[in-house]
Interface confidence: medium
């Protein structure tokens, strides 16, 4: 009796092999797909990290894309100087030169007449004169007492450049822009043979109900904390220090049942601003029990411990902490490289290969 296969059987074997191959390829593809969720309180740097991914892994912003940010740069600059001027009234700070009071009213009128994406020479002149004023500078130095964009000084110090009629924002200008994220922004890129899907989520508490239940099957969570927020008050809730708000959110994420098998990566961000602030504002503003010195290293290490101690499953869950400056492309590149290695290692572990 011969053991030759009929044409029908051969086709069935081929089909079976093809199914196996497809399953294997699907499995490999799934293993190469990385779903990253960016979480953190408002203005902690999540969207800046996303912008960095575009710069590092997608050849950055084209000239055309940069041009589209011009209106945001102008809006951020104008909002910043207006926030400082308004705060002067509340903090009872006088202008160094009384003639600046005229400029302040002129600012409001000109800003209200400004066309989006344009800055007239007179508006630029008014802002420049105000920014140079000693009273305005004194108020700027007390910015922890009111809400001010982190990028305020960056743009205001560079007004001569950004007010040029032919101004095109640079990659760094784009990185520094502040637009409140509403809803969920998805970004895709490939790195180290992995296909990343990164989800940027609005940090303000009003946004949280939109995403908290949606993200099972996430490979890793990058949780951003603004280190420099230790002496600020939360915008939506004047009662709670921003750092404590951030800790509360981290606690709820880190110990959430949906994220039991999810790697938690902690970005202690804005380390550059923190390093400057800690020289002037003691950490006891945020942590009255802190007895260490107000050096960058010791204060930063203390904040790191405060967050890592919130992890209730220390035996089974590791938190991977990095100190970051989201506006520094080299720093983000280095950190993200390390993060990817952790993800690869954990993926191999899940497949029993490590």
């Amino acid at each position: 009796m011969g053991c030759t296969l009929s044409a029908e059987d051969k086709a069935a074997v081929e089909r079976s092999k093809m199914i196996d191959r497809n399953l294997r390829e699907d499995g490999e593809k799934a293993a190469r797909e990385v779903k990253l969720l960016l979480l953190g309180a408002g203005e902690s740097g999540k969207s800046t990290i996303v912008k960095q991914m575009k710069i590092i892994h997608e050849a950055g912003y084209s000239e055309e894309e940069c041009k589209q940010y011009k209106a945001v740069v102008y809006s951020n600059t104008i909002q910043s100087i207006i926030a400082i001027i308004r705060a002067m009234g509340r903090l009872k700070i006088d202008f160094g030169d009384s003639a600046r009071a005229d400029d302040a009213r002129q600012l409001f009128v000109l800003a209200g007449a400004a066309e989006e994406g344009f800055m007239t020479a007179e508006l630029a002149g008014v802002i420049k004169r105000l920014w140079k004023d000693s009273g305005v500078q004194a108020c700027f130095n007390r910015s922890r007492e009111y809400q001010l964009n982190d990028s305020a000084a960056y743009y205001l110090n560079d007004l001569d450049r950004i007010a040029q009629p032919n101004y095109i924002p640079t990659q760094q200008d784009v990185l520094r822009t502040r637009v409140k994220t509403t809803g969920i922004v998805e970004t895709h890129f490939t790195f180290k043979d992995l296909h990343f899907k990164m989800f940027d989520v609005g940090g303000q508490r009003s946004e949280r109900k939109k995403w908290i239940h949606c993200f099972e099957g996430v490979t890793a969570i990058i949780f951003c904390v603004a280190l420099s927020d230790y002496d600020l008050v939360l915008a939506e809730d004047e009662e709670m220090n921003r750092m404590h708000e951030s800790m509360k959110l981290f606690d709820s994420i880190c110990n959430n049942k949906w994220f039991t098998d999810t790697s938690i990566i902690l970005f202690l961000n804005k380390k550059d601003l923190f390093e400057e602030k800690i020289k002037k504002s003691p950490l006891t503003i945020c942590y009255p029990e802190y007895a260490g010195s107000n050096t960058y290293e010791e204060a930063a290490a203390y904040i790191q411990c405060q967050f890592e101690d919130l992890n209730k499953r220390k035996d089974t869950k590791e938190i991977y902490t990095h100190f970051t400056c989201a506006t520094d492309t080299k720093n983000v590149q280095f950190v993200f490289d390390a993060v990817t290695d952790v993800i690869i290692k954990n993926n191999l572990k899940d497949c029993g290969l490590f």
Epitope: I78, Q79, I82, F108, V109, A111, G112, A113, A114, E115
Partner: nanobody, 120 residues
């Protein structure tokens, strides 16, 4: 539709007086801080004076302080600028404008302006 219509501009001799008016419609005038702004030939816009929504506080630019008086009548939806001791430097097109509600993106409303000429 928001409308601001200025009137009262004229040719006047140095040292003379004028009273400008601005009739507002299409918005709740009584809730807006209002401004007078001027533009001299070949020059940029210059803020002149402002008045709070209920007329309690007023502000003046340095060059006009003590000579100009801003006032309003919310029952008539009208803004005024009394100009005394006029100088050649005061010659300009005078506009009334709302204070911008969100401070940016073309949120202030402007009138078409009224011409003030100061000459002997």
């Amino acid at each position: 539709e928001v409308q601001l219509v200025e009137s009262g501009g004229d040719l006047v001799q140095p040292g003379g007086s004028l009273r400008l008016s601005c009739a507002a419609s299409g918005f709740t005038f009584s809730t807006y801080r209002m401004n007078w702004v001027r533009q001299a030939p070949g020059k940029g816009l210059e803020w002149v004076a402002s008045i709070s929504s209920r007329g309690i506080t007023t502000d003046y630019a340095h060059p006009v302080k003590g000579r100009f008086t801003v006032s309003r009548d919310n029952t008539k939806n009208t803004l005024y600028l009394q100009m005394n001791s006029l100088k050649p430097d005061d010659a300009a097109v005078y506009y009334c404008a709302t204070d911008p509600s969100t401070w940016y993106r073309g949120t202030a409303h402007w009138g078409q302006g009224t011409q003030v000429t100061v000459s002997s």
